[in-house]
Amino acid sequence: ARNGDRCPLGPGRCCRLHTVHASLEDLGWADWVLSPREVQVTMCIGACPSQFREANMHAQIKMNLHRLKPDTVPAPCCVPASYNPMVLIQKTDTGVSLQTYDDLLAKDCHCV
Amino acid sequence: ARNGDRCPLGPGRCCRLHTVHASLEDLGWADWVLSPREVQVTMCIGACPSQFREANMHAQIKMNLHRLKPDTVPAPCCVPASYNPMVLIQKTDTGVSLQTYDDLLAKDCHCV
């Protein structure tokens, strides 16, 4: 797949990594994660126009069929290509503990 | 993440595997693929409501933030969790060749 990286819709409009500020309450974690109130989450947001960061052949097919049958086949979607690990400090019966999650923070993005 | 498999929107409305019939022309492959002429493309289509087939912790976060900031954070998206290989008979300068593509047909789906 041609892995175009220039967004035809204008700067910042296409699929890319964004950082979203959130509180533990926002995430629904206030009852089991012990941490300051504000956290940063990296996630993949943005449009997936033709040939932009196509993850694979499937994404290419999907875009071609979306053009032909837009009511049936959705456009490719901006999702994480890989993740960064993050350690959560969790509340436990006996106090607190560390747990590493490998699938929590998006590291980079592509269109699928 | 709780990996719910019952669609709260009604049968067939949530993220699942669909088969879409397409010709080589539809796929934009007529000039380099000899066979098959008609392809049944399996792809992931459907909505991703809360807790439905959440791929990982990231999808859970994304849904929670989408509820709070729908204009900023999109809902999780229905994408392939794995792929089935497919063999294409391709035109070459010297004749034809067989090529296996591992990322062409969706095998199962989840929400990311």
């Epitope: 994660v33 300051p36 590291k107 | -």
Partner: antibody
Amino acid sequence: QVQLVQSGAEVKKPGSSVKVSCKASGGTFRSYAVSWVRQAPGQGLEWMGGIIPIFGTANYAQKFQGRVTITADESTSTAYMELSSLRSEDTAVYYCARGPIIMGYQFGLFDHWGQGTLVTVSS
Amino acid sequence: SYELTQPLSVSVALGQTARITCSGDNIGSHIVSWYQQKPGQAPVLVIYDKSNRPSGIPERFSGSNSGNTATLTISRAQAGDEADYYCQTWDSIGSVVFGGGTKLTVLG
């Protein structure tokens, strides 16, 4: 094998600034939190602040707020610490240290350290 | 701001058990890490989250944490264990806090 290699020793005049670099190799630079910790001669460890390249923002210990700037260049996998308005009490070995991203706290669990950079402030 | 207090020095006979304490208000509800620093070298993480050891750290090193005291325990102390040891946690705003450090001397 993760390695953090720091720039060489510096001698600075009071009132001036110093910028120390820390180049990472053997790991994914942006996936971790990089902190700066200093140690005055014969004294203990003191956290100055840190940066998470993927977030781009730095956090600083209150004591150093306004006087320290921590940056990161992902293209070269290098973190920098600049300390301004130097005084004799800033004479110390400055370490960069890497750890996982810790939800909310962000810095700590320093599993890899640079070799240290001695900064001497003297008139 | 949150403070961690360590004894300046601890002595242990070769082959015996050394215990280094780290006191802080309700430290039992904090995550505590321990670092070993030998003269002229950078610190090394030896214990995190009560009693987890990074790879390469001998089983002789263990940790515990409850109430107002966290403890680093080094069993069967060796001459090579002689070093400064620092505890570390976070304050309420997420800043990293180190204890003042304890010099461990192995006698004999």
